[in-house]
């Protein structure tokens, strides 16, 4: 049990106040983290509160400003990037968001040696992506879907690709579906470690169907947004990987990297690229039916001037019980011999663990094991491997950082974080300097987040980078809800849940219950992290009990739970929420006439299906930007879990799992349906179809749309959204305003 201290003493009770909705909407109780921008083994950059870019040397203890806020302000810079030779800084301004990761910006190059902006051969605008080479100060950038190279910032650019076309051919940047569902980045180009080569992806979207929606704006006529967006079963992007020698790029030209034969025989995806050395690169490919992944190690043959990907260096990862990997197929972390690597994949017991691959995957040596999961490999040095897992005390929603000594035999394992601030910190991530000389730990909770700097050899804490003192002080007179993380055992399934309880919670009383659900494959909602958010307010001020439940399909508890939903989304996720609600009712403090469920995105889908389950458990519920049919969602995501919507594959379940098919069952619940009209991700089409089905079934419901808003419903829409949902829930629970 994790009880967040409410800091309530009877004598002080009158000075304490509950959270207000305004607190949440204003971000009054938001926290800060500190991630050093490492530039060497012992140095990092950080943007100070007054916007100076400061270089810190851990070993000398010295710091100095490398770029003043005055220079930053002169071009309205919101971001920066130092060249590895420390001669130049790019300054980023005019940020303009596109999709989840992508944005365009204007870039200025500042010469640190003379304190002036580089004039002549200035960069075009707006640029879609820009990055320094890992050594020196070469620049690669993407402009109008084409890639350019500068040997020096003041040089004229060399155009590497010429076929880039809006919504047709993407070079060095992903198209919509690769950005959102495969790469999870705004870029698709990768420098080799010393900057000799530049690898890049080309995505051809020529044959992809286009989603079109209106953007209303302020003009007399709305404009139409067109995005090549492959829905389940549709034509997918065609991807090719090229590598160009950046020293003399005009000579040999871009060289296409061959796709493994077993992958190229049918539709496929490229999933990631990892440089090993300047002459060795590792590419990962995935069949469209995403249960087979191939890792291919390619070598540059100087004598032939070609990239050779021998079959002997192809490593196959296959899942027989679900899809390959977790959410994504894991990426390899290469060891110092530049051929063997560490990788997370399922062991024979169905838990994701670190394996060491020297020759073949069949001969992989398992490095971690147990009924828990290794989650991320942070760094491999010559003698240590740093990773995170949820092993400690068998809480799947925790993250601790471990070090395995790989230099000694047998390897020894040490938990670096488990006992540092045990009550406050149970969910960590880490950021390592070169050669892991130093690292920063960022603790996300369950207490107030704290970021600390550590010695990479001894693990000794050097200093606190950010401890959120202001937040701690601000919370001193706030009645925060209590939180507990526990588990239910039901029919051989473990359902972990987080319950958020009102500050003066009394087990003998009855409380309205709100279920917050996401429930998507490989997600996790029950995490030991700090948050003061909308549900904290609902518990603190409105006296609700809020519960989050991780059911079948969720992550980090083994493949049995994860792959249970394979090819049948919308069944067990819903069942498990319902099962948990029944168990909560049995606990005796839930008013079973006042139970609601809400969710966003995948959670909107699950909440809709739960409301339409016909159980009579839920009085009301909210779906924000829900998926309503898997035929409407992106191919890469949907097919990973559902297969294809074809007769000979899984069309039947595609049809059976829609929200629309259950329209009649909404008759006895209060349903609030919410969606942004400019949602590029889960298209407004989803809610339009739910609404149409409800109208056709003559079922009353409530709805709210947000004009020109995307999947995030940001800005003023956020305030309106949470205010609106609060009114809806209070009305449902008969709580006075």
């Amino acid at each position: 049990i994790v009880l967040r201290p409410s800091r309530v003493h009877n004598s002080e009770e009158n000075t304490m106040r509950a959270l207000t909705l305004k607190d949440i909407l204003n971000g009054t109780f938001s926290y800060k983290t500190f991630f050093p921008n490492w530039i060497s083994g012992q140095e990092y950059l950080h943007q100070s509160a007054d916007n100076n870019i400061v270089l810190y040397n851990i070993e000398t203890g010295q710091s100095y400003t490398i770029l003043s806020n005055r220079t930053m302000k002169s071009v309205n810079a919101s971001n920066y990037g130092l060249s590895p030779d420390r001669q130049f800084v790019y300054l980023e301004s005019d940020y303009s968001k596109l999709w989840r990761y992508s944005y365009t910006a204007t870039y200025y190059i500042y010469d640190l040696s003379n304190g002036e902006f580089v004039r002549g051969n200035e960069l075009p605008r707006p640029i879609q992506y820009l990055c320094w080479s890992p050594v020196g100060s070469k620049l690669a950038y993407v402009y109008q879907n084409n890639i350019y190279l500068k040997q020096r910032p003041g040089d004229p650019p060399f155009q590497i690709t010429f076929n880039g076309r809006e919504n047709k051919i993407f070079n060095g940047i992903p198209d919509w579906v690769y950005e959102e569902e495969m790469l999870a980045t705004k870029y698709a180009l990768w420098w080799s470690p010393n900057g000799k080569f530049l690898a890049y992806a080309e995505f051809n979207d020529t044959d992809i169907p286009v989603i079109a929606y209106s953007y209303y704006g302020d003009e007399q006529y709305p404009r139409t947004i067109n995005i090549p967006y492959p829905k389940a079963g549709a034509k997918n992007p065609v991807v090719r990987i090229f590598i160009i020698d950046t020293t003399y790029p005009a000579y040999v030209g871009p060289q296409e990297v061959p796709v493994p034969a077993m992958i190229a025989s049918s539709d496929y995806y490229f999933s990631w690229l990892t440089w090993v050395t300047d002459e060795r690169v590792c590419l990962q490919w995935l069949k469209r039916v995403q249960n087979v992944s191939v890792l291919s190690i390619c070598d540059f043959r100087e004598d032939w001037q070609t990239w050779d990907c021998p079959k002997t260096q192809e490593h196959i990862e296959e899942s027989r019980t679900g899809w390959a990997g977790g959410f994504f197929v894991s990426t390899p972390v290469f060891s110092y011999d530049a051929i063997s690597y560490y990788k997370i994949f399922s062991d024979k017991d169905g838990y994701k663990h670190i394996h060491y691959i020297k020759d073949t995957v069949e001969n992989a040596i398992q490095i971690t094991s147990g009924k828990w999961e290794a989650i991320n490999i942070f760094r491999v040095t010559q003698d240590s491997l740093f990773y995170s897992s949820n092993e400690f005390e068998e809480y799947p929603g925790r993250r601790n950082i471990y070090r395995i000594s790989i230099g000694s035999y047998p390897p020894s394992k040490k938990c670096v974080t488990c006992h540092l601030r045990k009550e406050r910190c149970q969910y960590y991530t880490a950021s390592f300097s070169d050669y892991a000389k130093y690292y920063a730990l960022v603790c996300y909770g369950p207490g107030i987040p704290i970021s600390t700097l550590h010695d990479g050899r001894t693990d000794q804490e050097i200093k606190i980078l950010e401890e959120n003192k202001e937040l701690e002080n601000a919370l001193k007179n706030i009645q925060l809800p209590k939180e507990e993380i526990k588990k239910l055992e039901v029919d051989e399934i473990t359902l972990w849940y987080k319950m958020i309880l009102p500050p003066q919670f009394d087990r003998s009383k009855k409380y309205p219950l709100l279920i917050q659900v996401y429930g998507g494959p490989c997600s996790q909602s029950v995490r030991s992290v700090f948050a003061v958010n909308w549900i904290s307010y609902l518990a603190s001020k409105e006296g609700m009990v809020i519960a989050l439940v991780d059911g079948r399909g969720t992550a980090f508890q083994g493949d049995k739970l994860l792959y249970a939903v394979y090819r049948k989304l919308g069944v067990y996720e819903v069942e498990d929420q319902i099962t948990a609600v029944r168990k909560f009712i049995e606990m005796g403090f839930i008013d079973e006439k006042r139970i609601a469920i809400w969710g966003w995105s995948y959670g909107g889908y699950v909440s809709s299906l739960a409301l339409a389950s016909g159980t009579g458990l839920f009085k009301c519920g909210i779906a924000v930007a829900p998926v309503s049919s898997w035929e409407y969602y992106a191919s890469v995501y949907t097919e990973r879990f559902m297969g294809l919507p074809t007769k000979d594959d899984n069309l039947e379940h595609y049809k059976n799992s829609t929200v629309m098919a259950r329209a009649e069952y909404f008759r006895n619940v209060d349903y609030l349906l919410i969606h942004g009209t400019a949602d590029d991700n889960v298209h407004f089409q989803n809610s339009a179809q739910i609404a149409k089905a409800l109208v056709n079934a003559q079922v009353d419901f409530q709805a709210m749309w947000y004009s020109d808003q995307n999947h995030g419903l940001s800005g003023l829409s956020t305030n309106h959204l949470y205010t609106h949902m609060t009114h809806f829930l209070k009305q449902c629970f008969s709580l006075s305003d």
């Epitope: 051969n121 004229p156 650019p157 003399y248 040999v252 030209g253």
Partner: antibody
Amino acid sequence: EVQLLESGGGLVQPGGSLRLSCAASGFTFSSYAMSWVRQAPGKGLEWVSAIIGSGSITYYADSVKGRFTISRDNSKNTLYLQMNSLRAEDTAVYYCAKGWFGGFNYWGQGTLVTVSS
Amino acid sequence: EIVLTQSPGTLSLSPGERATLSCRASQSVTSSYLAWYQQKPGQAPRLLINVGSRRATGIPDRFSGSGSGTDFTLTISRLEPEDFAVYYCQQGIMLPPTFGQGTKVEIK
């Protein structure tokens, strides 16, 4: 030893077609971008077209775009230039050269294309 | 497109003399993308100076390339009888790749 040998030139009427070939040997043909460069009688050099090693991407000078098609057959170590809608101003010696946009370090001996009625 | 202007059009020199050939670009090119070729009558061009001012394989060290930005020079330190030919500069930084009109080095 690297060798490039062009063939297929000759006399053709305006509006006619011709297909030039360039047989390559002495290097890993499929690894390299290849180009066609031409030289009108008594004039300078003019780049015409290029193709990357895999053959998947091609480039053309504006003067020939839509009329000429560059291609390659890596299994035969051969580069091609299909020339359609030929004009008098296409009259030139056509060279195949090893390289993409520059540093053409090996050239064929050239093949003469004469467009005349 | 980038226009390369070579000067002089013709250079009349005696064997043993130093030849300096100029190539001026209409916009910045940098030496990483500039090459020089030699062509003799009835023969294909031959690469002398590769992109990046590097001498091509088998080219004698009397040939050297220099320059940056828009101004480039090919220098032949001591002319040999076989050096009398037409010389072309070529840029490969921008599509289409372009050649200068050539400088003819003839025997005086």
